[in-house]
């Protein structure tokens, strides 16, 4: 009986050359998180969280991708091919599997200053 | 060497309480559900819930809700389960039972208690 | 809640004989599934997780098949220490177990 929800930092932009945290929350549920999964647009895996081994970030993201803050992922030296869909895909005893989408856009450096909400100065 | 260990066999009259423990050892207490499952004499087995051992939080399954109750204690990485208002019919053995695997394609209960016989006679 | 039904219940078998053990869930449980053995006055042990991935340790005669709602375990070669009795185990919701299927020497 899945009675959880995810909620993600949606639809987010974010300067080439800079840094920006993919944030998912998973709520209203007793369930017990095992393992949150990242992934990229392409289905490529980025880092996965696991409850008992900690963080393990692949190797072809190894410069870019920082652990959290929390359950997140900081994505650092943005280039415009990091523009897509990312997942976060939250592996819970009893529920299953919750997933959260989010959207990132890196714009030129040149575009003008946009919400910094989730963005690290 | 990981491994769940329980407490031993109580002999209770109708009425009692008690109080059963399972320690655990060998890996990180609070990143793994714990689970208690029933098998009365001669029955097959019965999953009374389980705890989370990160919040603290049980859930009971049905016909478990009321004199059952699930505990933890983390600081000594053990779960308890305590019966109140003990029945002739509570006589079972009773288990603990850690859910393995990280991804919900890995998960069962992969390292068990020994077991501890709960007989409620007069 | 989903209930699984085990078939047979009681199996009488020699050893070398291989092994048939069947699980139906009453709806759609992917590949969710485990197998226990349990020995008289002993606690059950995995031998297999997602119908048919062999937990470590578990002798390869052991093996699993299934999605949805049908589910097989087969012992290819009964050995001695075999006879025991095996249940089925869902994980697509709350955990329910089967009934059971009883091994015994013919």
């Known amino acids: 009986m899945m009675t959880g929800t995810i909620e993600t930092t949606g639809n987010i932009s974010a300067k080439k050359g800079g840094s920006v945290i993919l944030q998912c929350h998973l709520s209203s549920t007793m369930a017990q998180v095992t393992q949150v999964n990242w992934e990229q647009h392409d289905h490529s895996l980025l880092a996965i969280r696991n409850a008992e081994l900690g963080w393990h970030i692949y190797p072809a993201f190894k410069d870019r991708v920082a652990p959290g803050p929390g359950l997140g992922l900081t994505l650092q030296s943005l280039t415009m091919n990091d523009t897509g869909e990312y997942f976060c895909t939250y592996h819970t005893y009893p529920d299953g599997t919750y997933r959260g989408r989010i959207f990132l856009e890196v714009l030129e450096s040149s575009v003008a200053e946009h919400s910094a909400r989730f963005q690290i100065p | 060497e990981i491994q769940l260990v329980q407490s031993g066999s109580e002999l209770k009259k109708p009425g009692a309480s008690v109080k059963v423990s399972c320690k655990a050892s060998?890996?990180?207490?609070?990143?793994?559900?714990m689970n208690w499952v029933r098998q009365a004499p001669g029955q097959g087995l019965e999953w009374m819930g389980w705890?989370?051992?990160?919040?603290?939080?049980?859930t009971y399954a049905q016909g478990f809700t009321g004199r059952f109750v699930f505990s933890l204690d983390t600081s000594v990485s053990t779960a308890y389960l305590q019966i109140s208002s003990l029945k002739a019919e509570d006589t079972a053995v009773y288990y603990c039972?850690?859910?393995?695997?990280?991804?919900?394609?890995?998960?069962?209960?992969?390292?068990w208690g020994q077991g501890t016989m709960v007989t409620v006679s007069s | 809640a989903i209930r699984l039904t085990q078939s047979p219940s009681f199996l009488s078998a020699s050893v070398g004989d291989r092994v048939t053990i069947t699980c139906r869930a009453s709806?759609?449980?992917?590949?969710?599934l485990a197998w226990y053995q349990q020995k008289p006055g002993k606690a059950p042990k995995l031998l297999i997780y997602?119908?048919?991935t062999l937990q470590s340790g578990v002798p390869s005669r052991f093996s699993g098949s299934g999605s949805g709602t049908e589910f097989t375990l087969t012992i290819s070669s009964l050995q001695p220490e075999d006879f025991a009795t095996y249940y089925c185990?869902?994980?697509?919701?709350?955990?329910?177990f089967g009934g059971g299927t009883k091994v015994e020497i013919k």
């Open positions: 039972a850690r859910v393995g695997g990280y991804s919900v394609d890995e998960y069962a209960f992969d390292v």
């Open positions: 060998g890996y990180t207490f609070t990143s793994y559900p």
């Open positions: 705890i989370n051992t990160n919040t603290g939080n049980p």
């Open positions: 709806q759609g449980i992917s590949s969710y």
């Open positions: 997602a119908a048919s």
């Open positions: 185990q869902q994980l697509n919701s709350y955990p329910t």
